[in-house]
């Protein structure tokens, strides 16, 4: 941190390494929950027009796709991977792409992904041909 910028105690708004280098925050699509037409596709765009600066530098991009008898929704947010989201751990937070993984939720089909490149939750990928070992 530059000497003229105060470092406050217990500050999670700034992340530094041992040399004092500062981590810039993630840029993510952030439209909360919106109705979606994304269904039976290998990948979808979020159709979220808001790219937001995540509040804390450790936060990553998250997308949550849900389908029930009534509708389909897509949620796009920033979230701290140290904390569960919808009761699930963000296990793929370091991925550059948002690869959807199905989670068990009663009464609905529930997919979630997280990723850590700018606006990576704009393109959500359901296709089996992508996996965590894929270098792309």
């Amino acid at each position: 941190i530059p000497p003229h910028v105060q470092k406050s105690v217990n500050n999670d708004m700034i992340v530094t390494d041992n040399n004092g280098a500062v981590k810039f925050p993630q840029l993510c699509k952030f439209c909360d929950v919106r109705f979606s037409t994304c269904d039976n596709q290998k990948s979808c765009m979020s159709n979220c027009s808001i790219t937001s600066i995540c509040e804390k530098p450790q936060e990553v991009c998250v997308a949550v796709w849900r389908k029930n008898d009534e509708n389909i929704t897509l949620e796009t947010v920033c979230h701290d991977p140290k904390l569960p989201y919808h009761d699930f751990i963000l296990e793929d937070a370091a991925s550059p792409k948002c690869i959807m993984k199905e989670k068990k939720k009663p009464g609905e089909t529930f997919f979630m992904c997280s990723c850590s490149s700018d606006e990576c939750n704009d393109n959500i990928i359901f296709s089996e041909e992508y996996n965590t070992s894929n270098p792309d």
Partner: nanobody, 124 residues
């Protein structure tokens, strides 16, 4: 020598407006994503807004979305922040900072990545 020099701060009433400027020199301005970052008294840094080097794509924190507008004039090597509908919670020192697009960290603690800041006080 890299320099980032902010100006335009001051005392303004709630609901008022201010325009901040950041004059950049000593580096190739058009290669950097530029940021406005603020620090309220006794608080941590808040990343307010960013703008891409070319194409002028802009990004905002949710706390300022719709009230603040970031812009840049690459011919003048200057970054701007137009702040409207100011609130007491916008009171802070405002810094400009530079980032190589795609790079997640600044280089080191001595970095020439930050200006000295300009104080904005919103109070009646």
């Amino acid at each position: 020598e890299v320099q980032l020099l902010e100006s335009g701060g001051g005392l303004v009433q709630p609901g008022g407006s201010l325009r901040l400027s950041c004059a950049a020199s000593g580096f190739t301005f058009t290669e950097y994503r530029m940021w406005w970052v603020r620090q309220a008294p006794g608080k941590g840094l808040e990343w307010v807004s960013a703008i891409e080097p070319i194409g002028n794509r802009t990004y905002y924190a949710r706390s300022v979305y719709g009230r603040f507008t970031i812009s840049r004039d690459n011919s003048k090597n200057t970054l701007y922040l137009q702040m409207n509908s100011l609130r007491a919670e916008d009171t802070a020192v405002y810094y400009c900072a530079k980032q190589i697009p795609g790079r997640k960290w600044t280089a080191n603690s001595r970095f020439d990545y930050w200006g000295q800041g300009t104080l904005v006080t919103v109070s009646s």
